[in-house]
Amino acid sequence: DAHKSEVAHRFKDLGEENFKALVLIAFAQYLQQCPFEDHVKLVNEVTEFAKTCVADESAENCDKSLHTLFGDKLCTVATLRETYGEMADCCAKQEPERNECFLQHKDDNPNLPRLVRPEVDVMCTAFHDNEETFLKKYLYEIARRHPYFYAPELLFFAKRYKAAFTECCQAADKAACLLPKLDELRDEGKASSAKQRLKCASLQKFGERAFKAWAVARLSQRFPKAEFAEVSKLVTDLTKVHTECCHGDLLECADDRADLAKYICENQDSISSKLKECCEKPLLEKSHCIAEVENDEMPADLPSLAADFVESKDVCKNYAEAKDVFLGMFLYEYARRHPDYSVVLLLRLAKTYETTLEKCCAAADPHECYAKVFDEFKPLVEEPQNLIKQNCELFEQLGEYKFQNALLVRYTKKVPQVSTPTLVEVSRNLGKVGSKCCKHPEAKRMPCAEDYLSVVLNQLCVLHEKTPVSDRVTKCCTESLVNRRPCFSALEVDETYVPKEFNAETFTFHADICTLSEKERQIKKQTALVELVKHKPKATKEQLKAVMDDFAAFVEKCCKADDKETCFAEEGKKLVAASQAALGL
């Protein structure tokens, strides 16, 4: 339904508080380097303008699209050329090209300082002095560092952030109350950002059809009692929501997400028995709860899939008449029966089924041709099962840190051209699959592990896309969304790689390592490990383990020494020499 003024429509639907928050997120995700104060000023100007449109929808410029209004506002930033370079050229374009241009310049790895957490008392004072500014600053800092963060979900995080400070700044032990909550929000936020980044990559790089297929599989697992038509409706609506958010249309996205939550709760009887608690919550919590809701129980006595998808004489007729609908039904039926499969596995099975029908429905004997299609699924199912089994055994044997190190070595050997910080970040995240998923029973391991790995490998893909250095990474990232993980798994040592020149500076450490947190110290050691492998890609596990053990002992020894800096200098030289000898550098 058309509105005279889109901006007035969204302001009224969302309310002033959410409107302002979403506009701030949108602006911070586009202009990631702009100071906080500049964004607040722009947001206030947009908000005042929106209020004039609410008062009179026929007022000047109120009929303009949100992209036009927001783009015009962003293009008033005086330092656009100096700060953003060629991004300023976007302002010479007309909509919709201008917005597309802004989207293309979103930076997944912006050159921004690490967020350092102030002392608890300092934070509590800031919170009490100006709660509104404090919370806006949170939105701004997260949004600019995570330009694809799911905006309505960020509102939910901000609400929890506020609740944490409200509660803990009154507590007897503020730090004990607040710090675990902030750690949890940070970790959940990173995970949420990465999950959304995959959704946006899916839409932007592989198209709406790919996203819809993912959504059919996931929603069918989650709502196995819902009819196909119901799942299809939810998929269509969910696709619209994520298309909008990934496209920077955050007001529309948040509004449509609220509508979708409302629809789901009004129709929960025909969707899932698990929604009751979610639907009693306020809007932001409700939407989050629905997105995370556990899978409903599978209906009893579901018939064999073979009847409709292999044995029926109408398979090719049904496929030819409406290919995507028929494949959607196949995916729905398979997924609702298999909560124990990863979504990407289900999509591989659907792709195999589609390829088989494309071939066999043009064959002289179609039924004979596709009769054994389900047999082709067996190796596809067994491959991730075996991989997860092997890696969970390795994780249980090594523990998280050493499991991460094993993956660091594995991935550095596969794609040694990738930057060391990226290899460390990605391998550390890959390694977290162990503690995240291996504790689950068999029936939950694969969906946990492989779908998590898809999220992490997408981080590698988006970081690599910014500065491509490896054809192998590009190939695995672009050829097939659902085969990314098998593609990376199949990579062997890159025999074409010319080892990096040895640089002693890379392996020089100082006393500051002693004051780092355990996590930061691990990252330092893992950075050294990657560099070692880049220097000596043919080094054996045993050689690398020996060097890393010596390195750990060296750090421990020097951190206990009275004159730490002298210890690091003298013992460090010895360690480098010994390591070179051990590795034959």
Epitope: K313, C316, K317, Y319, A320, E358, K359, C361, A362, A363, A364, D365, P366, E368, C369
Partner: antibody
Amino acid sequence: QVQLQQSGAELVRPGSSVKISCKASGYAFSNYWMNWVKQRPGQGLEWIGQIYPGDGDTYYNGRFKGKATLTADKSPTTAYMQLSSLTSEDSAVYVCARGVILGSFDYWGQGTTLTVSS
Amino acid sequence: QIVLTQSPAIMSASPGEKVTMTCSASSSVSYMHWYQQKSGTSPKRWIYDTSKLASGVPVRFSGSGSGTSYSLTIRSMEAEDAATYYCQQWGSNPLTFGAGTKLEIK
């Protein structure tokens, strides 16, 4: 655009063999069945068989088993039909045709005339 | 194998006249396709999946049928329609063609 270019006319002795080619261009050769059809002068069309270049799968009309052998090569995107133990009955125009979903033939080659004569 | 019988074998029609030719199958088939062939050239797909017109085929042509009985109709005959028309079944191996209906212009 899709094109199927067949090899030239052949004049061969009875008892010998011949290999006819069909060079495909303008589409994903591996993903479509290539069919072969026989047409004798003044006669109707007779389906010989088909090959799927993606994996080499074949279907034959029982009447041509042992007579025709279908092969395909993905790198020059070419399908071949070898006819063996030739007799005058094999004199005909042979046409390759691309098969699509639900079994129709949407593109046809120009035909190769085979004459078997002593 | 399924035998397709086309009738009539030969027919002629005046310009503007409605033309109907049939293809009868010895047992039920899933889909029927029709091809047009003019002398000295390869056949061209004309009607496929029983009733769909191939690219470039004039809308005066139509196809219909199910089971064992299929037909091709020309609403209003034109000189360029003079050719031999073959039906072909899909759904049973081997694929088979009818013997053809030769359509001439009066």
